[in-house]
């Protein structure tokens, strides 16, 4: 950066490098260059040359001064105009931040995902502070008093291996940078109440041609929990509205439900599941969509909407159609 | 068994600055471990003044009344922990000690004998 | 900033007897508490540690109970070596900017 470059002289800021962002600035240039008493001094921001707010101190020193600084990172660096020298000469350079100092870590969740092998922390961090804002998770033993600390920049994976302190602990979040520090409330967690599932997916669907047609979507998880409660949501793609059927699952084999549906209407399915009686769901499964046939037989595959074809069999149409989910975060 | 062996006794006057020391020797300094600074005033309680973590990271941690006041460093090649100050007052006349479990846990089992600060002009 | 408020501040025995010394948080500690005795002259030692446990080589005449907000360190029988200022320690957590202090004011505790 510009901080990196030879000096013949000294430039500072006052209140700080890193300042709160909209404030009143200071940037001031003392120059120390042999055989020069400089005739001029030149502030310049990002490589552009500065024309107000400079004032004269001294023969060796100058003063830029801005107001309500709202730029997250400039290089600034001074120049003198010395007698008998055809270029200005640089004097000095530094990079300034301006931000804010971090919000209360809010929103602070823990969940271990069925087969991770990791406690995934995550939390609310507020606004954008703009400037490098580091974050230690705090994760203390309420059997052995035992803490570990963690240092991220964002959300932290920790080994259930390292949690060896028994099942209870508290977890807190430490937001720290240049301008301030703040930490969360403390959450209590179990690691036997965590647990998120392994996935649910929707496999296929199949409409059975019926006196009333019947919609039958397949679905499973990997998981090896044995009480898993699980939602599906459907509606419409030109519907706002979900509708939502709840079920008590036991994933030894591969979960029907069925549906009546209106005939010849594309629809969207989504399923998530949580331990029975857990605080943390899945995130919604990704975008399952199905259209329902007329009332002609027919059979969609693969994908979103694909040809359909006559099979005349009592399946009046299959679908194994997806799409990436829009909920991943969803777990509360 | 851990041993905290703190530095001598120290007379200073207003202004001058300071660093007492406590070595520790039976911890194991590649683990997780709080060492932290304790002080009591002639004639009074405990108060504590802060910790400095060392781990995989580095965190220091003071009561908000020694912040700015005093600063707590490691250096964990010699397993040695400090406490410092730049510039002296007649109040910071009192007994340091330094007190850890060897561990990441905050109760202190082990507790240094004590460095006693006098500043007089 | 959680403030530790021990009572009594002085507590007159007489050996053989029972003693008990409050520590109240003002709030939620969980079970982070540690117990100290200060004997004239010495740096403080460790007596109970996660409320209830007795630390190595402490005299199990010294018990602790309590979480939350409440805990009581009680002596069965006094003996005479006991005297000496005792503290409570909030051990939960040190890391929050606003703490001024993790121990209580400190309880003396002298023989009748």
């Known amino acids: 950066g510009i901080t990196n470059i030879n000096c013949s002289g000294h430039i500072w800021v006052e209140p700080a490098t890193i300042f709160k962002m909209g404030m009143n600035i200071s940037i001031y240039c003392q120059a120390a260059i042999k055989n020069c008493q400089p005739r001029k001094l030149h502030f310049y921001k990002n490589g552009i040359k500065e024309r107000f707010q400079i004032t004269r101190i001294n023969k060796t020193t100058a003063r830029l001064w801005y107001k309500n600084f709202l730029e997250p990172h400039a290089s600034m660096y001074c120049t003198a105009e010395c007698p008998k020298h055809f270029q200005e000469t640089l004097i000095c350079g530094k990079d300034i931040s301006s931000g804010y100092p971090p919000d209360i870590p809010d929103e602070v969740t823990c969940v271990i995902y069925e087969y991770s092998g990791n406690m995934t922390c995550t939390w609310n961090a507020g606004k954008l502070t703009y400037i490098d804002t580091k974050y230690v998770v705090h994760v203390k033993s309420l059997e052995t008093e035992e803490e570990q600390q963690y240092l991220t920049s964002s959300y932290i994976n920790i080994s259930t291996d390292s949690l060896q302190g028994g099942k209870k602990y508290l977890v807190w979040v430490q937001a720290a940078n240049a301008l301030g520090m703040e930490e969360s409330k403390q959450l209590q967690i179990h690691l036997d109440d965590i647990v998120i599932p392994s996935a649910a997916v929707i496999s296929r669907a199949e409409t059975i041609n019926a006196t009333v047609p019947k919609t039958i979507i397949y679905w499973d998880s990997q998981t090896t929990i044995e009480k898993v409660s699980c939602e599906m949501r459907y509606k419409a793609t030109t519907n706002q509205t979900w509708n939502v059927k709840e079920f008590d699952t036991n994933f030894t084999y591969v979960q029907q439900s069925e549906f009546y549906l209106e005939p010849n209407i594309k629809y969207v399915f989504q399923v998530r599941c949580q331990e029975t009686g857990k605080r943390y769901w899945q995130p919604w499964s990704s975008l399952f969509f199905h259209k329902t046939p007329e009332t002609v037989p027919q059979v969609t595959s693969k994908a979103f909407q694909h040809d359909t074809w006559n099979s005349g069999l009592t399946v009046a149409s299959i679908s194994t159609g997806h799409l990436t989910s829009d909920n991943r975060g969803d777990i509360g | 068994e851990v041993q905290l062996v703190q530095s001598g006794a120290e007379v200073k006057k207003p202004g001058e600055s300071l660093k007492i020391s406590c070595k520790g020797s039976g911890i194991d300094f590649n683990s997780n471990y709080y060492m932290c600074w304790v002080r009591q005033m002639p004639g009074k309680g405990l108060e504590w003044m802060g910790c400095i973590y060392v781990g995989s990271h580095v965190n220091t941690y003071y009561a908000n009344w020694a912040k700015g006041q005093v600063t707590i460093s490691a250096d964990k090649s010699i397993s040695t922990a400090y406490l410092q100050w730049s510039s002296l007052k007649a109040s910071d006349t009192a007994m340091y000690y330094c007190?850890?479990?060897?561990?990441?846990?905050?109760?202190?089992?082990?507790w240094g004998q004590g460095t006693l600060v006098t500043v007089s002009s | 900033d959680i403030v530790m408020t021990q009572s009594p501040l002085s507590l007159p025995v007489t050996p053989g007897e029972p003693a008990s010394i409050s520590c109240q948080a003002s709030?939620?500690?969980?079970?982070?508490l540690a117990w100290y005795l200060q004997k004239p002259g010495q740096s403080p030692q460790l007596l109970i540690y996660s409320a209830s446990k007795l630390a190595a080589g402490v005299p199990d005449r010294f018990s602790g109970s309590g979480s939350g907000t409440d805990f009581t360190l009680k002596i069965s029988r006094v003996e005479a070596e006991d005297v000496g200022v005792y503290y409570c320690?909030?051990?939960?957590?040190?890391?929050?900017?606003?703490?001024?202090?993790?121990f209580g004011q400190g309880t003396k505790v002298e023989i009748k």
């Open positions: 709030e939620n500690i969980y079970s982070f």
């Open positions: 320690q909030q051990t939960n957590r040190y890391s929050n900017p606003d703490i001024y202090n993790v």
């Open positions: 007190a850890t479990s060897g561990s990441s846990v905050l109760y202190f089992k082990f």
